[in-house]
Interface confidence: low
Amino acid sequence: FNISGCSTKKLLWTYSTRSEEEFVLFCDLPEPQKSHFCHRNRLSPKQVPEHLPFMGSNDLSDVQWYQQPSNGDPLEDIRKSYPHIIQDKCTLHFLTPGVNNSGSYICRPKMIKSPYDVACCVKMILEVKPQTNASCEYSASHKQDLLLGSTGSISCPSLSCQSDAQSPAVTWYKNGKLLSVERSNRIVVDEVYDYHQGTYVCDYTQSDTVSSWTVRAVVQVRTIVGDTKLKPDILDPVEDTLEVELGKPLTISCKARFGFERVFNPVIKWYIKDSDLEWEVSVPEAKSIKSTLKDEIIERNIILEKVTQRDLRRKFVCFVQNSIGNTTQSVQLKEKRG
């Protein structure tokens, strides 16, 4: 299709080389007054416009994204050629940063209802640059945490080094929806609830003598509880002796509850004590069996192919540890009688 009639928007993504970050493009079809070809629903001032209710469609996935190759080749369907770019409804998610994401991206409705709808499209010229060392060293992270029940703020990474007074007008989106009230480089949250979690996008306009473009950053915000002050506790095994049958296989499970920690490095391992010797056992990987906001339950099993007399003289010890401390639980095997 002919893209010469598409409205054009220029965006800049400056990514940090020292952190993982994502990026998004919205299929921002023009407002009705800008193009009579795009039949967008008119919104009352109180409604928050979503990207994008074009042609009365409720299905926001009715959008096709293309990339325009720089060598003049035909447009490429994003879904077929770029697995690191994911289309979620009408938003394009870039999962990995890199200058090779630079280029022209075009979106248009899949459903063409009249010959004129071909012009209902947006061309986004994306420039991707690594952050230079000269950029602010302490810029806000692209992953930010809010402590539940307390006051917090979400900072726009590309503007976090500027004072509020210097900051240009910022447009914020949360999970693809415009936050029409927010215009500064920080969103202040008086009391944090779990619904404050999500993907936030901040946009502001920069210009030089020739043109203007939108600088965009994406922030993943999670709501968390405070770091635990407790060492992990072992939920299983509870008993320190276990009745077993000689010659039979045996699996002993160690389940431990770890309180939430922002930097979470749980340790759960099995070792064997035999008289004055002690050694760690190579056992299957630990697995998380329950994860909540406040804690996580992790399980790790020790597997004996068959129980021997020697095993009855040993102690099997489960050892768990977090940044606060460690806990152990030992199990002595006892032959089942009768």
């Epitope: 697995p83 690191h84 994911i86 979620d88 990995t96 090779n100």
Partner: antibody, heavy 117, light 112 residues
């Protein structure tokens, strides 16, 4: 196209590296998977590597199999080989079909690895 | 890890007939539709036939039809041709960091 190489006879406990070479498309644009097939048996997915170089594995393959990439090739390293690893190893390109996920749309002819003493 | 169970195997039918292969997943595939069918002939690599449960891959005849959702899927081959004799595999994607994909055990189709 995609082509695997490096298949050979290896003794139990040994290691080897298989290489997958892509031509006609860029590994910067596609994730790549390794799949194996023991003689007369079914297909078994080993793992895949993303365009950004991060690799993901089947539970059974973790530890002994390592997938890595350069700009032109994707490698599969097998360590502590056992006779169960005797198989034809395929490299497959993954194409993204939208929200539903990825599929293997282009396969190499495979390379045979035999583990025997 | 998810397990995909294919039935029956082998299955045979005459030229011009129809065969139906079933694939049962132990857990729902990603978005209920990350399921593909592959055809493999002896000495050859697999070939993608159907993806997204029912979308026929490029160059594949419309005689191949996929259906189902979630955990239960079916491949139907109608107007069987001699060239359809092969082993057919279903494969599910799970969008997870480990065990991202799983293959069914395969179903051999014999054309009489």
């Amino acid at each position: 196209s995609v082509e695997e190489s490096g298949g050979r006879l290896v003794t139990p406990g040994g290691s080897l590296t298989l290489t997958c070479t892509a031509s006609g498309f860029s590994l910067n644009n596609y994730h790549m998977s390794w799949v194996r097939q023991a003689p007369g048996k079914g297909l078994e997915w080993i793992g895949f590597i993303r365009t950004d170089g991060s690799a993901f594995y089947a539970t059974w393959a973790k530890g002994r199999f390592t997938i890595s990439k350069t700009s032109a090739t994707v490698d599969l390293k097998v360590t502590s080989a056992t006779t169960e690893d005797t198989a034809t190893y395929f490299c497959a390109r993954m194409f993204y079909a939208g929200d539903s996920g990825h599929y293997f749309d282009l396969w190499g002819p495979g390379t045979l690895v035999t583990v025997s003493s | 890890a998810a397990v995909l169970t294919q039935t029956p195997s082998p299955v045979s039918a005459a030229v011009g007939g129809t065969v139906t292969i079933s694939c049962q997943a132990s857990q729902s595939v990603h978005n209920n539709k990350n399921l593909a069918w592959y055809q493999q002939k002896p000495g050859q690599p697999p070939k993608l036939l159907i993806y997204d449960v029912s979308t026929v891959a490029s160059g594949v005849p419309s005689r191949f039809k996929g259906s189902g959702s979630g955990t239960q899927f079916t491949l139907t081959i109608s107007d069987l041709e001699c060239d359809d004799a092969a082993t057919y595999y279903c494969a599910g994607g799970y969008g997870s960091y480990t065990d991202t994909f799983a293959f069914g055990g395969g179903t051999e189709v014999v054309v009489k």
